[in-house]
C-alpha cells in the first residue's frame, strides 16, 4: 500500500522522492502525476524534469530540494481538500520497464 503523508488546509504539502543520479550532466527524467502510477509515464502530470531542468510544471507545484542531486521531492503550495489523493513519482530510467515508481498518498486535514 501507499505511504501516507499529511498536511493541513492552507499549508504546503511535502511528498518525498529520491534517486541517485549516475552523473551530474546526465540526470534521469522524472515525472509527478496525480493518481497512481500507470504502466507508462504519469497520468495527470503536474511536474516534469528532463536531463537538466524542470521543464513542465503547474502553478502550485515545485521541487524545493536539489533535484539535480536526486532530491525530486514535490512541494504543493497552499493545499485544499481537493489535493487529497494518490500521487505518482516516476523515475524514468532508460530501458524497457526500468522505471522506479512510487505511489504516495496525501491526506489533507
Amino acid at each position: 500500500s501507499e505511504v501516507e503523508y499529511r498536511a493541513e488546509v492552507g499549508q504546503n504539502a511535502y511528498l518525498p522522492c529520491f534517486y541517485t543520479p549516475a552523473a551530474p550532466g546526465n540526470l534521469v527524467p522524472v515525472c509527478w502525476g496525480k493518481g497512481a502510477c500507470p504502466v507508462f509515464e504519469c497520468g495527470n502530470v503536474v511536474l516534469r524534469t528532463d536531463e537538466r531542468d524542470v521543464n513542465y510544471w503547474t502553478s502550485r507545484y515545485w521541487l524545493n530540494g536539489d533535484f539535480r542531486k536526486g532530491d525530486v521531492s514535490l512541494t504543493i503550495e497552499n493545499v485544499t481538500l481537493a489535493d487529497s489523493g494518490i500521487y505518482c513519482c516516476r523515475i524514468q530510467i532508460p530501458g524497457i520497464m526500468n522505471d522506479e515508481k512510487f505511489n504516495l498518498k496525501l491526506v489533507i486535514k
Epitope: 550532466g25 528532463d50 536531463e51 537538466r52 531542468d53 524542470v54 521543464n55 510544471w57 502553478s59 502550485r60 507545484y61 515545485w62 521541487l63 524545493n64 530540494g65 536539489d66 533535484f67 539535480r68 512541494t75 503550495e77
Partner: antibody
Framework: QIQLQQSGPELVTPGTSVKISCKAS????????INWVKQRPGQGLEWIGW????????KYNEKFKGKATLTVDTSSSIAYMHLSSLTSEDSAVYFC???????WGQGTTLTVSS | QIVLTQSPAIMSASPGEKVTLTCSAS???????LYWYQQKPGSSPKLWIY???NLASGVPARFSGSGSGTSYSLTISNMETEDAASYFC?????????FGGGTKLEIK
C-alpha cells in the same frame, strides 16, 4: 583557475550574422554546461540557452530559437554562439557563463547598425 | 516561464543602514537554484549569493540571503559605499531560466 575568455566587440550591419566565442580554461571542458546570457544597455539579463559540450546537447529559450545557435569545439575548449538575421534589437552585451553561473566571461559587445 | 519580480527597482541607502531587496517568483522555484548577482557598470555579473543563502567567495558577511518557494530576499546589515551596484536575482531550476529586472542600489 577557471576562466572564460570571450571574443572582442563586433560592429555589424543589419541582416548579417555574427559568431561570438568563449574559450574555457582551468577545468575539463566536456564535463560542464556552458550558458549564454544577453544584456541590453541599461536593462536586465536574459538567458539564451545552454550547451553540454560532452554531448553537444542544447536547450534554447523559446525567445531565441532561430536567432541563436550554440556549438562547441571540444578540441580547443571553445563554445560559440552564432546570431543570425541581426537587427538593432540584437545590439547588446552577450555573456557566456559556466555550468552553475559561478564563472562569467567578460562579455562581448555587439552593435548592429547601418 | 517563471517571472521574477524585484523590488524596489531603485533605492538609495546611507552608510550603516540596513537594506533588504526582495525577489518574488510567479511560481515556486527550488531554493537550491535561486541565486543573486552583483553587477557594476561595465562589468560582468558576479555571483553574490547562491542556493538562496550561501555567500559566494569573497562576499562580505554583512550580506545574507533567505527565502523559499516564491519569496526570496537579500539583506545588507550595514550598507557600505562599495555595495552601491545593481543586484539581480536568478532562478535556474525551471526552463527557461529567468532573471529579475534588478534593483539598483545607490549610496546616499
Amino acid at each position: 583557475q577557471i576562466q572564460l575568455q570571450q571574443s572582442g566587440p563586433e560592429l555589424v550591419t543589419p541582416g548579417t550574422s555574427v559568431k561570438i566565442s568563449c574559450k574555457a580554461s582551468g577545468y575539463t571542458f566536456t564535463d560542464y554546461y556552458i550558458n549564454w546570457v544577453k544584456q541590453r544597455p541599461g536593462q536586465g539579463l536574459e538567458w539564451i540557452g545552454w550547451i553540454y559540450p560532452g554531448s553537444g546537447n542544447t536547450k534554447y529559450n523559446e525567445k531565441f530559437k532561430g536567432k541563436a545557435t550554440l556549438t562547441v569545439d571540444t578540441s580547443s575548449s571553445i563554445a560559440y554562439m552564432h546570431l543570425s538575421s541581426l537587427t538593432s534589437e540584437d545590439s547588446a552585451v552577450y555573456f557566456c557563463a559556466g555550468d552553475r553561473f559561478d564563472y562569467w566571461g567578460q562579455g562581448t559587445t555587439l552593435t548592429v547598425s547601418s | 516561464q517563471i517571472v521574477l519580480t524585484q523590488s524596489p527597482a531603485i533605492m538609495s541607502a546611507s552608510p550603516g543602514e540596513k537594506v533588504t531587496l526582495t525577489c518574488s517568483a510567479s511560481s515556486g522555484v527550488s531554493s537550491s537554484y535561486l541565486y543573486w548577482y552583483q553587477q557594476k557598470p561595465g562589468s560582468s555579473p558576479k555571483l553574490w549569493i547562491y542556493s538562496t543563502s550561501n555567500l559566494a567567495s569573497g562576499v562580505p558577511a554583512r550580506f545574507s540571503g533567505s527565502g523559499s518557494g516564491t519569496s526570496y530576499s537579500l539583506t545588507i546589515s550595514n550598507m557600505e559605499t562599495e555595495d552601491a551596484a545593481s543586484y539581480f536575482c536568478h532562478q535556474w531550476s525551471n526552463s527557461p531560466y529567468t532573471f529579475g529586472g534588478g534593483t539598483k542600489l545607490e549610496i546616499k
